[in-house]
């Protein structure tokens, strides 16, 4: 079957890195500069991705694979294959349409990306605030006065930070 297909379609013999050139009797021609074909039997080569501006080249384009980009310092990747770069902020801030803005009172962000999240409400667990929260750090909850007994654990660390929002759809 493979041999029959090859006889019927000479293009199926063209390997990755080449294309089936209709202008030259369907012979396999190498992909031109700045283009690639990652699979065999292609009738055209795809244009290589250019990593410019905020995008840096992580992997150069070759005749058989596309370039890969990442983001310049101060930015981080979003989307499949780093299709976008998003600005970093300082800890204690979040990114908005108006740039990096400080977290509002009662919220914090301990990362350079993502959103400000509310401080843990210690009283919901019947605990008291042992260490106050800041823009950069969550509160630390301690035992309620009634819980203070010999051998009792004195500090409950806050729940681990979840990955913040701002992820692409």
């Amino acid at each position: 079957f493979e041999r029959t297909r090859s006889l019927q379609d000479p293009c199926s013999n063209c390997p990755a890195g080449t294309f089936c050139d209709n202008n030259r009797n369907q012979i396999c021609s190498p992909c031109p500069p700045n283009s690639f074909s990652s699979a065999g039997g292609q009738r055209t080569c795809d244009i290589c991705r250019q990593c410019k501006g905020v995008f840096r080249t992580r992997k150069e384009c070759s005749s058989t694979s596309n370039a890969e980009c990442d983001c310049t310092p101060g930015f981080h990747c979003l989307g499949a294959g780093c299709s976008m770069c998003e600005q970093d902020c300082k800890q204690g801030q979040e990114l908005t349409k108006k740039g990096c803005k400080d977290c509002c009172f009662g919220t914090f962000n301990d990362q350079k990306r993502g959103i400000c999240r509310p401080w843990t409400n210690c009283s919901l667990d019947g605990k008291s605030v042992l260490v106050n929260g800041t823009k950069e750090r969550d509160v630390v909850c301690g035992p309620s006065p009634a819980d203070l007994s010999p051998g009792a654990s004195s500090v409950t660390p806050p729940a681990p930070a979840r990955e913040p929002g701002h992820s692409p759809q």
């Epitope: 501006g53 905020v54 979003l78 989307g79 299709s83 976008m84 770069c85 998003e86 600005q87 990114l95 908005t96 349409k97 701002h166 992820s167 692409p168 759809q169």
Partner: nanobody
């Protein structure tokens, strides 16, 4: 091909003015937020200004507020940055960029950038 091309950079004296332009092609310009960023020598890339699809929302980094004005002409597929009262610290490569699909609903990322135009402020 989706493309952004900046122009209008050059050498200008402190206190002077320049107008940068960015021509867009290969996509529906009026559907996207647009940006100016800059990179001063030896420094990280910095957001300068952004504008929404119809030009009704504009935002600036504090250091250029009141001196720079971002605008767009959707009929001409063009973005502009009018820079007045220029200072030595405005010396940088200025880049035009497009907000990614879904910008401000789910992220604040950019996906298409120009090659940049150089602005030098010096006496």
């Amino acid at each position: 091909e989706v493309q952004l091309v900046e122009s209008g950079g050059g050498l200008v004296q402190p206190g002077g003015s320049l107008r940068l332009s960015c021509g867009a092609s290969g996509f529906t310009f009026s559907s996207y937020w647009m940006f100016w960023f800059r990179q001063a020598p030896g420094k990280e890339l910095e957001w300068v200004a952004n504008v929404n699809q119809d030009g009704s929302e504009k935002y600036y980094v504090d250091s250029v507020e009141g001196r720079f004005t971002i605008s767009r002409d959707n009929a001409k597929n063009s973005l502009y940055l009018q820079m007045n009262s220029l200072r030595a610290e405005d010396t940088a490569i200025y880049y035009c960029a497009r907000g990614g699909e879904g910008y401000s609903d789910s992220h604040y990322g950019t996906d298409v950038w120009g090659q940049g135009t150089t602005v030098t402020v010096s006496s």
